[in-house]
């Protein structure tokens, strides 16, 4: 790589940063950036609040949250004061007719009669054939099965009560959840009238009952958590300590660890090459060729032809060669990456508070999601409930004259219709009135608000951390020159001056994400379409948008670092960050990959460590522990293990995201430092001695030989 060529490349991406004698790290005297975007964002938030208030005023989430019987009366209120739970006669019809959108808009509504009951059924029961001719009183009332609709005569025939759907044909042991009776016991599936021949439904029901496996399971799970929550917390504490320890120890072991990891990857690739060669050789000797196979969509068939393994071998060999070449020719860059990782470890050690900033982000994200969810729920229930006539089997004798789907009054049920099972059921909410007519637009506004606020919160986190870590890098005398409260001051600074810039970056990302969501929705709708061209175009679009989102995230991240340091607006910061990175593209790629590798290993270490410890502890394989450390007796020991592993992953991700931000910030600062300074007395480098040593540079010593501490 010639120097002249390099200069030309650099100039294509702007001039290197000039020395600025006044620059002392994150600039103190700032002004507000992207004011227009800030105003726009604040107006949007104001609008979002207004939407929330309107939703709150017009909405009635009771309609979704509180159970209502078939007549539209709430359970647990008024005439049903002593009947707080809702029983679905055939809960499986809910499963067959429910999807996420209908639940979001209309609550859990099912095309089956619903009755308020004082307690949920405790035992499995099905109407026996010999009970069809008995009276409702004999079968239901005297057996304490008070689950029929109100007012069904005692001496009515059971079969006619079932035909009119006045009484349930089966009961499943249920537990109240969200005020509704949901099956929870592993019962043998009752022979359900009307659906015995429908295999898919029957299978679905069996599957559902299996998956709702048993009151015992629910109780056992609860017991297990009750017995092991303390130890789960201990496991999470271990995950926290391991994450911290890993990050803090990086300054000591980063070099050897990176080397071991790279060699490990080389080893894995080498084994892959060997394995592919062996498979290829065996198949070649057999003469198994792709020409014999012909075209097939069965991918597993390709495993049995030599060309597949040859192709895999070539790919792995190329990857191995590239990695070896990188190791040989870019070892200097790898050393810089290692030194930066060590530096990042030091920075985190100096500013431990940054490690817990993800909690702030988490809380803010939770607030955004909760606000959106509540607003969406209230909006969805802002219309007047509409009821229509409905019958489970419109082909029944007497139903032909009934106008199904015509509006009706739920308080005036068609009690004695000629059509069996005719009911006045909840259909949805009316779209009369300005709010109701604008409902779709308001929901879209809400979704936009959700994405924008979420992205803004994430941007805030990145910018705050960047500000804190930049103040570490640009402290000439470490730790003396580091501000007292770097995180808090970075937080205040970011909120005060850069809300607009963060909103701008978040908006760009939001628009791309919304486009992706729309594309996913279209793709979902076109699932049935078998047109390969359409599928291909859709795939290309999705791929392009995915790449665009990745790129914008990368650009935004670095723009926020520049904003945190220089306090310039989003566009200038993004341009500066981009050109700076492009001038050092090889370093960027190497650092990025080394960091990814290291953090992946870190996560693996933390999650694996906690997982192994949890496994040995909860499965009682660790012998000789004191009485205080005895593992609890559990029904399902995998439950706390899985909980611990998932918790450990979340914790590790939180910590390592901070560390990743730290590395990126220090890297950008390092590149700036290289371009801005030259090591002379008036332009000393701010980087650590180890980095200077790797680069073969040094700072001139002052005449009085007062060496600055590093």
């Amino acid at each position: 790589m010639g120097g002249k060529q390099r200069d030309k490349d650099d100039e294509a991406y702007g001039k290197p940063v000039k020395y600025d004698p006044s620059f002392r790290g994150p600039i103190k005297n700032r002004s507000c950036t992207d004011v227009i975007c800030c105003v726009l964002f604040l107006l949007f938030i104001l609008g979002y609040i207004v939407v929330g208030i309107v939703a709150w005023l017009y909405g009635d989430p009771r309609q979704v949250l509180y159970p209502r019987n078939s007549t539209g009366a709430y359970c647990g209120m008024g005439e049903n004061k002593d009947k707080p739970y809702l029983l679905y006669f055939n809960i499986f019809s809910c499963i067959l007719s429910t999807n996420i959108i209908s639940v979001a808009e209309n609550g859990l509504q099912c095309p089956t009669p619903q009755v308020c009951v004082s307690s949920c059924p405790e035992d499995p029961w099905t109407v026996g054939k010999n009970q069809f001719s008995q009276t409702v009183g004999e079968v239901f009332y005297t057996k304490n099965r008070n689950f029929c609709l109100p007012g069904v005569p005692w001496n009515m025939m059971v079969i006619t009560s079932l035909q009119q759907e006045l009484c349930p044909s089966f009961l499943l042991p249920s537990a109240p959840a969200l005020g509704r009776c949901f099956p929870w016991t592993n019962v043998t599936l009752p022979e359900l009238p009307g659906i015995t021949n429908d295999t898919t439904i029957a299978q679905g029901i069996s599957g559902l009952i299996d998956s709702l496996n048993a009151r015992d399971i629910s109780v056992k799970i609860f017991e297990d958590f009750a017995h092991s929550w303390y130890w789960i917390l201990v496991a999470l504490g271990v995950a926290l300590l391991l994450s911290l320890l890993f990050i803090l120890l990086l300054r000591l072991v980063a070099g050897p660890l990176v080397l071991v990891l790279i060699l490990g990857v080389l080893g894995v690739l080498a084994y892959g090459i060997y394995y592919c060669w062996e498979e290829y050789r065996v198949l070649r000797d057999k003469g198994a060729s792709i020409s014999q196979l012909g075209f097939t969509t069965n991918l597993s068939a390709y495993q049995s032809v030599q060309e597949t393994w040859l192709a895999a071998l070539i790919v792995l060999a190329v990857l191995e060669a590239i990695l070896l070449l990188v190791l040989i020719f870019l070892r200097q860059r790898i050393r810089i990456a290692i030194a930066l990782l060590k530096e990042a470890s030091k920075a985190v050690g100096q500013m431990m508070s940054t490690m817990f900033y993800p909690l702030v982000t988490f809380v803010l994200l939770l607030i955004c999601i909760a606000y959106w969810a509540m607003t969406a729920l209230y909006l969805a229930t802002s219309g007047q409930p509409q009821y229509v006539l409905w019958a489970s089997n419109i082909s029944s004798p007497g139903c032909e004259k009934v106008s199904i789907n015509t509006s009706c009054n739920p308080m005036d049920q068609p009690v004695n219709s000629s059509c069996p099972g005719l009911m006045c059921v909840f259909q949805g909410y009316s779209s009369k009135g300005l709010v109701q007519r604008s409902l779709f637009n308001l929901q879209i506004y809400g979704v936009l608000g959700l994405f924008w606020t979420l992205n803004w919160v994430l941007a805030l986190g990145q910018c705050v951390l960047a500000g804190a870590f930049a103040s570490f890098y640009w402290a000439f005398h470490k730790p003396q020159d580091i501000p007292t409260f770097p995180l808090i001051s970075a937080f205040i600074r970011t909120l005060r001056y850069h809300t607009g810039s963060l909103a701008f970056g978040a908006l760009i990302l939001t628009l791309v994400q919304i486009a992706r969501v729309i594309l996913e929705y279209i793709d979902h709708k076109l699932r049935g379409v078998q047109n390969p061209v359409a599928r291909c175009i859709m795939c290309c679009f999705k791929c392009c948008l995915w790449c665009l989102e990745k790129f914008i995230k990368f650009l935004n991240r670095n723009a926020y670092i520049m904003i945190a340091i220089y306090g310039k607006n989003f566009c200038v910061s993004a341009k500066n960050a981009f050109t700076l990175l492009m001038r050092n593209i090889v370093r960027v790629v190497v650092l990025d990959k080394v960091t990814d590798l290291l953090l992946f290993f870190g996560k693996l270490l933390v999650v694996g460590g906690v997982g192994v410890l949890s496994f040995f502890f909860f499965s009682g394989r660790i012998q000789g522990l004191g009485r205080d450390f005895k593992s609890p007796h559990l029904n399902y020991y995998w439950l706390p293990i899985m909980t611990s592993i998932m918790g450990a992953y979340v914790i590790a991700s939180g910590f390592f995201s901070v560390f990743g931000m730290c590395v990126d910030t220090l890297f950008l600062c390092f590149l700036e430092d290289l371009e801005r300074n030259d090591g002379s007395l008036d332009r000393p480098y701010y980087m650590s001695k180890s980095l200077l040593k790797i680069l073969g540079k040094k700072n001139e010593a002052p005449p009085d030989n007062k060496k600055r501490k590093k």
Partner: antibody, heavy 125, light 107 residues
Framework: QVQLVESGGGVVQPGRSLRLSCAAS????????MHWVRQAPGKGLEWVAV????????YYADSVKGRFTISRDNSKNTLYLQMNSLRAEDTAVYYC??????????????????WGQGTTVTVSS | DIQMTQSPSSLSASVGDRVTITCRAS??????LAWFQQKPGKAPKSLIY???SLHSGVPSKFSGGGSGTDFTLTISSLQPEDFATYYC?????????FGPGTKVDIK
């Protein structure tokens, strides 16, 4: 074809007993519920009793409850009505009728479809 | 018990007339109502079940309607063989009960 033939009617003194039979043919007797319906001279029809296909459930009109017993012998394809403590007001033509509900139609109940020709019971001293 | 009432108790009509008989239940019986035809000295014959469905072999001139408490039997074009007594019966609530009957005779 489906046929129901009643027998056992006659003249009987008040307080005495009588047993009516109904022989069924042309269908699977054991799968159907059966009714007894009576008609007093010059009057309308009055439902008396029902027995379901397996004999498990029996229901009676209030006027005969405790005095009449409906039963069936599926092996003989025969329906019975045992009438005890007969009264003058029990004088009527007694019909047996098949219920259209068989144990196989889960959700449809249609009531009676096929009737016998009837047997006359006269309660007189 | 459910009381069934029929009106009129008797009616005179000519061949070709359209005749409607009404049956009323003392409480709601949904559509569990049957209509029977009985000629003098003969056993009753089932015409209609579920308020409006014809038993097999019953001519389409007979039609039934209604639900709940009020029901009707209509003979669209009266023929000589249709002069008889017509009974309604509810069959959902024990004890099953018949209406008093409507006698249709020749004018």
């Amino acid at each position: 074809q489906v046929q129901l033939v009643e027998s056992g009617g006659g003249v009987v003194q008040p307080g005495r007993s009588l047993r009516l039979s109904c022989a069924a043919s042309g269908f699977t007797f054991s799968s159907y519920g059966m009714h007894w319906v009576r008609q007093a001279p010059g009057k309308g029809l009055e439902w008396v009793a029902v027995i379901w296909y397996d004999g498990s459930n029996k229901y009676y009109a209030d006027s005969v409850k405790g005095r009449f017993t409906i039963s069936r012998d599926n092996s003989k394809n025969t329906l019975y009505l045992q009438m005890n403590s007969l009264r003058a007001e029990d004088t009527a033509v007694y019909y047996c009728a098949r219920d259209r509900y068989s144990g196989y139609d889960y959700y449809y109940y249609y009531g009676m479809d096929v009737w016998g020709q009837g047997t006359t019971v006269t309660v007189s001293s | 018990d459910i009381q069934m009432t029929q009106s009129p108790s008797s009616l005179s009509a000519s061949v070709g007339d359209r005749v409607t008989i009404t049956c009323r239940a003392s409480q709601g019986i949904y559509n569990y109502l049957a209509w029977f035809q009985q000629k003098p000295g003969k056993a009753p014959k089932s015409l209609i079940y579920a308020a409006s469905s014809l038993h097999s072999g019953v001519p389409s001139k007979f039609s039934g309607g209604g639900s709940g408490t009020d029901f009707t039997l209509t003979i669209s074009s009266l023929q000589p063989e249709d002069f008889a007594t017509y009974y309604c019966q509810q069959y959902t609530i024990y004890p099953f009960t018949f209406g008093p009957g409507t006698k249709v005779d020749i004018k």
